[in-house]
């Protein structure tokens, strides 16, 4: 967890705290979805590996419009070190598999908390 | 239908060394993380600790360093406390807790508590 | 550690009360606060997470406000069943800590 990094802020944000706001955010999105998640778009599966921040914000930045997810876009580009523009792939895309982003913000979270809980416990 | 199923009462003479298990059922045992607390006679809560059922990592109370260790079995979903040293002032209900951090917090389910009695 | 000061320790209510119990962290725990009820010879029970968020199956009456250092358990009308002990822990970080507890007696 010491690789990720804070987001904008007054003051340095630890990183543990970085990604615990993440995640709940994505809890939150995951609780208030009433009508399909970005009106069911569909986004590129990525490999939960540790590019999988920048590779992440890659894939949901090709979805416009929806204003469930912007908080969370944000919030990953502040754990990818590089600008990330739409259009853009990296090699953690499984290029031949696309997913709702309603699938995609459940695996991303169910890969995040195991991430917070091996941060904490290690 | 969440359950955390602790092992029986335990009476042990000062010194010996006692194993607490508790099994989960109803959820994925490495999903959630897994702690342990005292209830002393008449007395609060105390967190001793917890550990990561999947990695096996832990996390612990400065006071109960060197007297509780934790293990978790990813074969038959349970989680194991060890007591050493035992001593008088170790007598007390123990528990076991768990849940999920995000959602129902980390002390959403407990087992039913295991009593712990050291007397010679 | 973090220290949570819970008061008051004790107190008597009738049914049909409204009951405020407080708790008090010695730093900010970003609203990771829990409220266990807790009946004598029986394991806690979990009423509240996140200092707001009711657990499934619990009834409306209780409620959890604060963010902060502050954080205050609410049950709205106080029902037979209700007599207990009450805990609160927060779980911002390690070492998770609890509140010393409030016994709610009958008046």
């Known amino acids: 967890l010491t690789c990720l990094g804070g987001f904008a802020s007054p003051g340095p944000v630890p990183p543990s705290t970085a990604l615990r706001e993440l995640i709940e955010e994505l809890v939150n999105i995951t609780q208030n979805q009433k009508a399909p998640l970005c009106n069911g778009s569909m986004v590129w599966s990525i490999n939960l590996t540790a590019g999988m921040y920048c590779a992440a914000l890659e894939s949901l930045i090709n979805v416009s419009g929806c204003s469930a997810i912007e908080k969370t876009q944000r919030m990953l580009s502040g754990f990818c070190p590089h600008k990330v523009s739409a259009g853009q792939f990296s090699s953690l895309h499984v290029r031949d598999t696309k997913i709702e982003v309603a699938q995609f913000v459940k695996d991303l979270l169910l890969h995040l908390k195991k991430l917070f809980r091996e941060g904490q416990f290690n | 239908e969440v359950q955390l199923v602790q092992s029986g009462a335990e009476v042990k003479k000062p010194g010996a060394t006692v194993k607490i298990s508790c099994k989960v059922s109803g959820y994925t045992f490495t999903d959630y993380e897994m702690h342990w607390v005292q209830q002393a006679p008449g007395k609060g809560l105390e967190w001793i600790g917890g550990?990561?059922?999947?990695?096996?990592?832990?996390a612990s109370n400065q006071k109960f360093k060197g007297k509780a260790t934790l293990t978790a079995d990813k074969s038959t979903d349970t989680a194991y406390m060890e007591l050493s040293s035992l001593r008088s002032e170790d007598t007390a209900v123990y528990y076991c807790?768990?849940?999920?951090?995000f959602g129902g917090g980390p002390f959403a389910y407990w087992g039913q508590g295991t009593l712990v009695t050291v007397s010679s | 550690d973090i220290q949570m000061t819970q008061s008051p320790s004790s107190l008597s209510a009738s049914v049909g009360d409204r009951v405020t119990i407080t708790c008090k962290a010695s730093q900010d725990i970003n609203s990771y606060l829990s409220w266990f009820q807790q009946k004598p010879g029986k394991a806690p029970k979990s009423l509240i997470y996140?200092?707001?968020r009711l657990v499934d199956g619990v009834p409306s009456r209780f409620s959890g406000s604060g963010s902060g250092t502050d954080f205050t358990l609410t049950i709205s009308s106080l029902q037979p069943e209700d007599f207990a002990t009450y805990y609160c822990?927060?779980?911002?970080?390690?070492?998770?800590?609890f509140g010393g507890g409030t016994k709610v007696e009958i008046k």
């Open positions: 807790t768990s849940g999920d951090y």
């Open positions: 822990l927060q779980y911002d970080e390690f070492p998770y800590t």
């Open positions: 996140r200092a707001n």
């Open positions: 550990i990561d059922p999947e990695t096996g990592g832990t």
